[in-house]
């Protein structure tokens, strides 16, 4: 018997210091480029090897970025979001939403959660 898949959503504040090659990640999303149906939010699509985000270790592919240095990322065009990151300065504070996949087995059994990609 297969269990249903649920998601555990958590939020975290991540402070990154811009490295020699920048912050070290890619994003998708925006009002003109929806990554998730009916959601114009900004999502992390790639963490670059040895970049600031990878070395910090907390930001994950698939995370939703809610704000940058306190500025909300809701209802932004994709390029406007990109520009916001590029102009965010040396110390960058990200409010992110992680979504962990939790496999619920048959009644009485709860499987372990895996980060969703």
């Amino acid at each position: 018997m297969n269990g249903r898949v649920d998601y555990l959503v958590t939020e975290e504040e991540i402070n990154l210091t811009r490295g020699p090659s920048g912050l070290g990640f890619n994003i998708v999303g925006g009002t003109d480029q929806q990554y998730v149906s009916n959601d114009s939010g900004i999502y992390v699509s790639r963490i670059k090897e040895n970049g600031a985000a990878a070395l910090d270790g907390r930001l994950q592919e698939g995370d939703k970025i809610l704000s940058v240095n306190g500025q909300d990322l809701k209802n932004l065009l994709h390029q406007d979001a990109v520009d916001l990151f590029r102009n965010a300065g040396y110390a960058v504070s990200l409010r992110v939403q992680h979504r962990l996949q939790v496999q619920n087995g048959p009644i009485g059994h709860r499987g372990e959660g895996d980060p969703s990609g």
Partner: nanobody
Framework: DVQLVESGGGLVQAGGSLRLSCAAS????????MGWFRQRPGKERDVVAT????????YYLDSVKGRFTISRDNAKNTVFLQMNSLKPEDTAVYYC??????????????????????WGQGTQVTVS
């Protein structure tokens, strides 16, 4: 994680054609940059062709330009490598690779251009 499964390899005579396919699962395919790499006997793995997540930018190894074509079908979560006018030196294990696409938050130019972090198991292509 992203899972990649290649198919379409085999034995073909010089001058012949093969079409490799790579089916991806595990996350939205339309957000992935895709690539084909190959490892020839006794050599390192080389990039053959890449296609970005939007499908509007491709790259080809000089020696395959005009003979190989990379394409993607986002509805089928699949990337293809059409290989024509095959030569014995194309004999290799061909690997499908993926990475997250999207826009770099750092600059318009991507460092580590061929840095891919998800790999298939490979499919053998032998040209006799």
């Amino acid at each position: 994680d992203v899972q990649l499964v290649e198919s379409g390899g085999g034995l073909v005579q010089a001058g012949g054609s093969l079409r490799l396919s790579c089916a991806a699962s595990g996350r939205p395919f339309s957000s992935l940059d895709m690539g084909w790499f190959r490892q020839r006997p006794g050599k390192e793995r080389d990039v053959v062709a890449t296609i970005n997540w939007t499908g509007d930018s491709t790259y080809y190894l000089d020696s395959v330009k005009g003979r190989f074509t990379i394409s993607r079908d986002n509805a089928k979560n699949t990337v293809f490598l059409q290989m024509n006018s095959l030569k014995p030196e194309d004999t290799a294990v061909y690997y499908c690779a993926a990475r997250g696409g999207g826009s770099s938050v750092d600059s318009e130019y991507d460092v580590g251009e061929f840095e891919y972090n998800y790999w298939g198991q490979g499919t053998q292509v032998t040209v006799s």
